[in-house]
Amino acid sequence: IWELKKDVYVVELDWYPDAPGEMVVLTCDTPEEDGITWTLDQSSEVLGSGKTLTIQVKEFGDAGQYTCHKGGEVLSHSLLLLHKKEDGIWSTDILKDQKEPKNKTFLRCEAKNYSGRFTCWWLTTISTDLTFSVKSSRGSSDPQGVTCGAATLSAERVRGDNKEYEYSVECQEDSACPAAEESLPIEVMVDAVHKLKYENYTSSFFIRDIIKPDPPKNLQLKPLKNSRQVEVSWEYPDTWSTPHSYFSLTFCVQVQGKSKREKKDRVFTDKTSATVICRKNASISVRAQDRYYSSSWSEWASVPCS
Amino acid sequence: RNLPVATPDPGMFPCLHHSQNLLRAVSNMLQKARQTLEFYPCTSEEIDHEDITKDKTSTVEACLPLELTKNESCLNSRETSFITNGSCLASRKTSFMMALCLSSIYEDLKMYQVEFKTMNAKLLMDPKRQIFLDQNMLAVIDELMQALNFNSETVPQKSSLEEPDFYKTKIKLCILLHAFRIRAVTIDRVMSYLNAS
């Protein structure tokens, strides 16, 4: 058993039929010695008396809020949560496996630049009685500070018969140099509590590997005389690291109709302009990627050919 | 500790081309190592990230763009002094800081070159003959060093009398390639910045 936060404890259980469970001793946080009784949740049934209560925790019915009283007055609470371990593996029932970039990916993180700011998100089908707490650091043995905000519900989607909820959190490395060469990864730890179930999820990454620039901005078209060619120009996104001559981007320019199966024109360039062939009912799209370290491409920025 | 804006004329920077070739060569070599050594811990997630130049050179600090010198997190206190002549420099316009930056890059290359050559000698003794260093990568390191053209003491190639542990050597190769790729990215950024200034 260990303390998650004040008056909240996590009991780690090997989860299999007829498992013996864990013996837990609860101590009432009071100077009183006599006349103390214990109850669980809203029940008035007295579970025991005395300053300590010894319980055998085997299942979710044994978890919950244990309260010690004296003469009708509440002295203290202890909330017991269960963390299940099945076949030596901690349960991952609360969050959905996003399967990208690989199986067992519960947390996904992205950074728009090298400032040390990043966003992580996760998915669940659970809508109520759900709380998240996020901690992060650079490295684990001698951790350096990363400050994370509160996790918030960022999107709701319908997936078949199920509703899916996306939560996200923003974190910022306390002292980040955009030009630094990372040798220790960022560690992100998410504690998830659903009713009386506790789970934890972790992700480890280098900022350089989770870079995904914002789309290029200010796309403009200039038709070329006596030609079907169009000069398209754009600018670096405002959120990208500066100076741009040091943090350079490369771009992919594509002309395509509404369907992915349609024919297209595509060209890659390090410049902020390119010449392409425009077709009726097609769009010109541009996306960006770090020129020197190939992490993710940005989303497309698009303008219609006409 | 930083690069002032007074640098060579745009497009007149011979090291840019070499640094692009360097990044390409080390990225290709790393990809080849990952594929060939697929049953070894050779991915970014699996290896320890070591920097053989740590406390010996200060390339990131010495080559910091002027715009980042206002960022206190970038101003590490490490300082190293270097020899200050080099052919990538447009002599009259070259600042002392830029010379420091380029000579730090030179020292990095020299250290990695020695490590890679030593490692290759060991890998050539491996009866499995599983992986060798790409001669093109070694040549590109050499070309960039020649373009930088700093006079520097020759670092003797490490020779080892004990029987090489080929498993450890291959893991060390992965560690070295990952670190060198990251340094090659920094070098490319620096050269691009200098070329544009």
Epitope: R228, Q229, T250, R261, E262, K263, K264, D265, R266, V267, F268, T269, D270, T275, I277, R279, K280 | -
Partner: antibody, heavy 118, light 107 residues
Framework: QVQLVQSGAEVKKPGSSVKVSCKAS????????LHWVRQAPGQGLEWMGW????????EYAPKFQGRVTITADESTSTAYMELSSLRSEDTAVYYC???????????WGQGTLVTVSS | DIVMTQSPLSLPVTPGEPASISCRAS??????LHWYQQKPGQASRLLIY???QSISGVPSRFSGSGSGTDFTLTISSLQPEDFATYYC?????????FGQGTKVEIK
């Protein structure tokens, strides 16, 4: 199986014109750009121009501008390349090639030898 | 026009050995570079597109690398059917241009 089948060899006099055909099978004809590329004996490849069969849009290499005309007939899934004012240096194998991407070629025809000789 | 220069123009190789063909552009073309294989009397075949992207159906022994002005086609272990002429082609700008070709011959 996508295929491009070209017309047979031609012998032409200097100053005349030649029209080479390229019939596509497999896939929808108008879903692809169609290009013409030539190769003089013992020489490399030389791009001549492209057509979008969907709308008839064309673009030609400046070297051939005014002398080459590329057309397409959707009903027969056939593209044509006509080269006029022939000279001996136009002796070459002419290839048609196509792709859904405009700037490179994933399927090529077998080639048509055009000999220009007096 | 962008001039594409291949080297060597002729490359004698022993079967089973690796082979590398270089292609240089007269100006930077990013990764807008494609490789083709040509055999006498056969339709040309696309091997690699956008410098390093592999094509399904093309053996994995063919790989491409490079960006900017310098590109390489590598055949890791030459098979008898690989003896042919190889061309690079730039698609950075029109007119599309090819290298002069490299003939890979049996040593």
């Amino acid at each position: 199986q996508v295929q491009l089948v070209q017309s047979g060899a031609e012998v032409k006099k200097p100053g005349s014109s030649v029209k080479v055909s390229c019939k596509a099978s497999g896939g929808t004809f108008s879903d692809y750009y169609l290009h013409w590329v030539r190769q003089a004996p013992g020489q490399g490849l030389e791009w001549m121009g492209w057509i979008d069969p969907e709308n008839g849009d064309t673009e030609y290499a400046p070297k051939f501008q005014g002398r080459v005309t590329i057309t397409a007939d959707e009903s027969t899934s056939t593209a044509y390349m006509e080269l006029s004012s022939l000279r001996s240096e136009d002796t070459a194998v002419y290839y048609c090639a196509r792709n859904k991407e405009l700037r490179y070629f994933d399927v090529w025809g077998q080639g048509t030898l055009v000999t220009v000789s007096s | 026009d962008i001039v594409m220069t291949q080297s060597p123009l002729s490359l004698p190789v022993t079967p089973g050995e690796p082979a590398s063909i270089s292609c240089r552009a007269s100006q930077s073309i990013s990764i807008n570079l494609h490789w083709y294989q040509q055999k006498p009397g056969q339709a040309s075949r696309l091997l690699i597109y956008f410098a390093s992207q592999s094509i399904s159906g093309v053996p994995s022994r063919f790989s491409g690398s490079g960006s900017g002005t310098d590109f390489t086609l590598t055949i890791s272990s030459l098979q008898p059917e690989d003896f042919a002429t190889y061309y690079c082609q730039q698609s950075n700008s029109f007119p599309l241009t090819f290298g002069q070709g490299t003939k890979v011959e049996i040593k």
